[in-house]
């Protein structure tokens, strides 16, 4: 009878083990070990027993001890089980973005590791176990499917192998893959809301606002705003799960016509977009022409208004007859027409909307000078010592210069408050002078003495 000790060994891959072979008789004819492993006989030993050191054990093996005693030949095997932790434990890459509400499949690839019967693969979310399965096959792939919610955003998923050798070497060997962080997103099925002018005039500035609710994570959302080929640069305001993108838009004559305004909100792997038509138009202000902007009184003046070919004009509130882009009328200039405004209002229909433009011109009428009784009375009677303000207004365009002198030297203080004295009494010659000539008028000041009262 041949004995072997230990009959079973579990050892790390590449490790060594000492095995004792012994014979049942005192003086065996033969005592040895049969194994393909590198082996060395080591001390101690005896006549009927030998110690062997088996080294670099790479795989499971069953070395055999044999002995030849007078009562016959026999053999005994020792079972060597090699253990080693997996060479590769890898969680397959997660999608860059995972939509909320859609199931996620986690895949863990495990290469190597033995004994397989003691190898378990655990899929984890953070520290929480999602699934636990045995590793089957030389190169195992373990999968599990998990529903994805908003709270999974930023969660770390990993895969762990457990080589449980606690029944043998009181050890649990763990290998954990590098964690992969999940990015989840939620983009509603509703398109963004786009608020913008339907019509936009060339060389003017308009404001476009694009907003969308129900986004997660809102900070990761991107907004693309464009009018035709012109990409806009919006300022984005974020709410809890909403965003609002506001941009200014200025258009040029080259863009005249119908343009597409696009707002696209991109989140994760999805996009929601809204398109709107904006009509770009050019509408210069109407022209108001006067034959001459400055005329002498009595001169005939033609007032003319001309606008965009498709516009309809009104001149001083009177529509053109027939309705169209031109209107005019003729007047004889009077002093009352000086400073008179002539207003032309043009109306253009753009994409069903009416847009208005106004232009105003002022007429200057040259007249005078004039000194009227109404504005420059010829006779003043004032009590002596009273406070009075002599008034005399000369009219004309250009505005005349006014002087009122008594005896050619003593001025009447026009427009100034004075205390009436005897010296003030007399006849003054008021002279209004402008580039258009001069007029004179006599003004008499009477002073009443208190004794006459």
């Amino acid at each position: 009878q041949t004995s072997v000790f230990p009959p079973e060994v579990i050892l790390p891959r590449g490790g060594s083990v000492k095995v004792n072979c012994s014979a049942s008789c005192d003086q065996p004819i033969l005592l040895g070990m049969e194994t393909p492993l590198p082996k060395k006989e080591i001390l101690p030993g005896g006549n009927n027993w030998k110690m062997y050191e088996l080294s670099n054990v790479q795989e499971d093996s069953q070395p055999m001890c044999y002995s030849n005693c007078p009562d016959g030949q026999s053999a005994a095997k020792t079972v060597l089980t090699v253990y080693w932790t997996p060479e590769r434990v890898e969680l397959a890459p997660l999608p860059p973005w995972q939509p909320v509400g859609k199931n996620l499949t986690l895949r863990c690839q495990v290469e190597g590791g033995a004994p397989r019967a003691n190898l378990t693969v655990v899929l984890l979310r953070g520290e929480k176990e999602l699934s636990r399965q045995s590793a089957v096959g030389e190169s195992a792939e373990v999968t599990t499917t998990v529903p994805v919610g908003r709270d999974d955003h930023g969660a770390n998923f990993s895969c762990r192998t457990e080589l449980d050798l606690r029944p043998y070497v009181l050890k649990l060997f763990e290998n954990t893959s590098a964690p992969h962080q999940l990015q989840t997103f939620d983009l509603p099925a509703t398109p963004p809301q786009l608020v913008s002018p339907q019509v936009l005039e060339v060389d003017t500035q308009g404001t476009v606002v694009c907003s969308l609710d129900g986004l997660f994570p809102v900070s990761e959302a991107q907004v693309y705003l464009a009018l035709g080929d012109q990409k806009l640069n919006p300022t984005i305001t974020y709410g809890d799960n909403s965003l609002s993108a506001k941009a200014s838009v200025k258009v040029t004559a080259e863009e005249e016509g119908t343009q597409q305004l696009l707002c696209a909100v991109m989140l994760g792997t999805q996009t929601q977009e809204t398109r709107q038509t904006v009509t770009i138009y050019s509408f210069p202000a109407p022209n108001v022409n006067l034959t001459k902007p400055e005329v002498s009184e009595g001169t005939e003046v033609i007032v003319e208004c001309e606008a965009h070919p498709r516009a309809k004009v009104m001149l001083n509130g009177v529509p053109a007859q027939p309705p169209g882009p031109r209107a005019q009328f003729v007047l004889k200039a009077t002093p009352e027409d000086n400073g008179r405004s002539f207003s032309c209002s043009a109306t253009l229909e753009v994409a069903g909307q009416l847009v208005h433009k106004n232009q105003t011109r002022e007429l200057r009428v040259l007249y005078g000078p004039r000194l009227d009784e109404k504005d420059c009375p010829g006779n003043w009677t004032w009590p002596e010592n009273s406070q009075q303000t002599p008034m005399c207004q000369a009219w004309g365009n250009p505005l005349p210069q006014l002087k009122c002198l008594k005896d050619g030297t003593f001025p009447l203080p026009i427009g100034q408050s004075v205390t009436v004295t005897r010296d003030l009494e007399g006849t003054y010659l008021c002279q209004a002078r402008s580039t258009r000539g001069e007029v004179t008028r006599e003004v008499t000041v009477n002073v009443l003495s208190p004794r006459y009262e």
Partner: antibody, heavy 121, light 107 residues
Framework: QVQLKESGPALVKPTQTLTLTCTFS??????????VGWIRQPPGKALEWLAL???????YYSTSLKTRLTISKDTSKNQVVLTMTNMDPVDTATYYC?????????????WGQGTLVTVSS | DIELTQPPSVSVAPGQTARISCSGD??????ASWYQQKPGQAPVLVIY???DRPSGIPERFSGSNSGNTATLTISGTQAEDEADYYC?????????FGGGTKLTVLG
């Protein structure tokens, strides 16, 4: 560092018993795997292994001298003692003690300087 | 019991390679060690476990062991290497030494 030193009589008469002591330092005979052995070398001849004692107090002897040899240890004193009975002039030799760092592999990594024992009447 | 056989002497020119053999039945199944002994001194371990070198032993000393023969190789032999060399193995539970080889460095 590891050191070993042999001590005992330089001259022994035939039929007497030789007692040799190996005093060591730098290691302990209570350390698993360690052992101390004795080797002798007659003048101008080869080395001859005599005996070995290990940390577990297991003792091994040369088959040809087994009946005459006894090896023992005093772990607390860091000493190993070899006695050899019935000495004969052919036992004249330099006696060495040496350390086995791993007895299972049988090599001796550090040797004492040796002590010459002459057997003569 | 196993017997270890060594050539009594080996000569080598300085700088050349010296090889000392040690043969014994199935010696490759056991570990072999080598010791260097200079006149009047205790042996010094130069190779253990067939091919391992203790610290302090020059790299020119190397060993191998397979089949029935263990070999000590000294490459680039120097004058100071002149000594007696003993191989050692075991036949459980006996420890066995070879008869020794005198290495002479010529010149």
């Amino acid at each position: 560092q590891v050191q070993l030193k042999e001590s005992g009589p330089a001259l022994v008469k035939p039929t007497q018993t030789l007692t040799l002591t190996c005093t060591f330092s730098g290691f302990s005979l209570s350390t698993s795997g360690v052992g101390v052995g004795w080797i002798r070398q007659p003048p101008g001849k080869a080395l001859e292994w005599l005996a070995l004692i290990d940390w577990d107090d297991d003792k091994y002897y040369s088959t040809s001298l087994k009946t005459r040899l006894t090896i023992s240890k005093d772990t607390s004193k860091n000493q190993v003692v070899l006695t050899m009975t019935n000495m004969d002039p052919v036992d004249t030799a330099t006696y060495y003690c040496a350390r086995y760092p791993v007895t299972q592999r049988s090599y001796m990594d550090v040797w004492g300087q040796g002590t010459l024992v002459t057997v003569s009447s | 019991d196993i017997e270890l056989t060594q050539p009594p002497s080996v000569s080598v020119a300085p700088g050349q390679t010296a090889r000392i053999s040690c043969s014994g039945d199935a010696l490759g199944d056991k570990y072999a060690s080598w010791y260097q002994q200079k006149p009047g001194q205790a042996p010094v371990l130069v190779i253990y476990d067939d091919s391992d070198r203790p610290s302090g032993i020059p790299e020119r000393f190397s060993g191998s062991n397979s089949g029935n023969t263990a070999t000590l190789t000294i490459s680039g032999t120097q004058a100071e290497d002149e000594a007696d060399y003993y191989c050692q193995s075991y036949d459980s539970p006996q420890v066995v030494f070879g008869g020794g080889t005198k290495l002479t460095v010529l010149g």
